[in-house]
Interface confidence: medium
């Protein structure tokens, strides 16, 4: 049994880091493998992660960390029984993938303005809480070409757009994702999408 693709890990910088790797053949990850991880810190505790299958030869492990600071570094040991298959390290602050925003809501009752709001996925005491910026994706269910991205570079989790920038009388969907420049993170996953029917009063034409 050998590791074909070494573990790569990302952290949500809150409580979970996710590591994925591939074995050289079909593997029952949860029964055959264990990923041990330990903060590189005197008197720290060692922890064991039981991996799950992620495709035939792929494995994924969700490492509970419960707390993360920028200086943290973890040792990772991948074991198959008594055999050490791979040894590495992982610094969560250098591999951050933020949690996805939630509770995306489209408010259509503000005159002819659409107000999109969502929730910051982090609690106020987390470092990322005040460092997230967002991308909002809006698309038409009827027209695949009607697809747009709005970059929200301020901290408030909301976006206002004129309803008239979208076509009237058709349904749209929106979703939002986050990233943090301070840790050069990857983008989060997209939030679940929300749907609304766009309608607004056409202005009278002037003759």
């Amino acid at each position: 049994m050998k590791v074909l693709q070494e573990p790569t890990c990302v952290s949500d910088y809150m409580s979970i880091s996710t590591c994925e790797w591939k074995m050289n053949g079909p593997t029952n990850c949860s029964t055959e493998l264990r990923l041990l991880y330990q903060l590189v810190f005197l008197l720290s505790e060692a922890h064991t992660c039981i991996p799950e299958n992620n495709g035939g030869a792929g494995c994924v492990c969700h490492l509970l960390m419960d707390d993360v600071v920028s200086a943290d570094n973890y040792t990772l040991d991948l074991w198959a029984g008594q055999q050490l298959l791979w040894k590495g390290s992982f610094k969560p602050s250098e591999h951050v993938k933020p949690r996805a925003p939630g509770n995306l809501t489209v408010h259509t009752n503000v005159s002819d303005t659409l107000l999109l709001t969502w929730s910051n996925p982090y609690p106020p005491d987390n470092y990322l809480y005040n460092h997230l910026t967002y991308a909002v994706n809006i698309w038409s269910e009827n027209d695949p070409a009607d697809f747009r991205i709005y970059n929200v570079t301020y901290l408030e989790p909301s976006l206002r757009i004129a309803a008239s920038t979208l076509k009237s009388g058709i349904s749209y969907r929106a979703r939002v994702r986050a990233w943090a420049q301070c840790y050069n993170t990857t983008w989060s996953e997209w939030s679940p999408s929300t749907k609304w029917h766009n309608s607004y009063r056409e202005p009278f034409e002037q003759h």
């Epitope: 903060l39 810190f41 005197l42 505790e45 060692a46």
Partner: antibody, heavy 118, light 111 residues
């Protein structure tokens, strides 16, 4: 919200016994080493005992002043943590705090008072 | 055992001024890139509260007027500007090795 609540303190005679309990909530208890720290009236802080996690074989450590008299234990399924104190001495009179430990002792309970007196 | 010597034992500071508390360890508490020194605040009738961990990191929720510095054997806690609510006893603590020890405490009062 992390919470640690101690109980079991009280008045006991010298050479008597007492068992302190600490109920933990709001965090993954089984991931943390836990400590007991005490503070005699009007005095400073003294580390008493420490217990590690299951992955670390529930290893235990004690201050010399309590070794062979105190026993630290934990029940991860109930998120409980204990200090069995035997052969108590008057100098064990103190407020006893249960404390979570990661990089430092980051969360403390309110404490339970132990008085050893005849 | 590592002995932590804290000074001064008590400190009287005017509102808005700087309070500086020192802690000296009998041997180095720094290794592998970490300094295993921490600072706690204790108010009467309350448990200690972690202010600074690993010498210089401010614990979440602690005001920015608290700062820590140092490495090896010499460490400092600074409070600036001092506020009324900072009246308390401050302890340094190491977890470089067992047994863990604490400094004897510094009582901060406002002039």
């Amino acid at each position: 919200e992390v919470q640690l609540v101690e109980s079991g303190g009280g008045l006991v005679q010298p050479k008597g016994s007492l068992k302190l309990s600490c109920a933990a909530s709001g965090f993954s208890f089984n991931m943390y080493a836990m400590n007991w720290v005490r503070q005699a009236p009007g005095k400073g802080l003294e580390w008493v005992a420490r217990i590690r996690t299951k992955s670390n074989h529930y290893s235990t450590y004690y201050a010399d002043s309590v070794k062979d008299r105190f026993t630290i234990s934990r029940d991860d399924s109930a998120s409980m943590f204990y200090l069995q104190m035997n052969n108590l001495k008057t100098e064990d009179t103190a407020m006893y705090f249960c404390v979570r430990h990661l990089r430092a002792m980051d969360y403390w309970g309110q404490g339970t008072s132990v008085t050893v007196s005849s | 055992d590592i002995v932590l010597t804290q000074s001064p034992a008590s400190l009287v500071v005017s509102l808005g001024q700087r309070a500086t508390i020192s802690c000296r360890a009998s041997q180095s508490v720094s290794t592998s890139g970490y300094s295993y020194m921490h600072w706690y605040q204790q108010k009467p009738g309350q448990p200690p509260k972690l202010l600074i961990y690993l010498a210089s990191n401010v614990q979440s929720g602690v005001p920015a007027r608290f700062s820590g510095s140092g490495s090896g054997t010499d460490f400092t806690l600074n409070i600036h500007p001092v506020e009324e609510e900072d009246v308390a006893t401050y302890y340094c603590h190491h977890n470089r090795d067992l047994p863990f020890t604490f400094g004897s405490g510094t009582k901060l009062e406002i002039k």
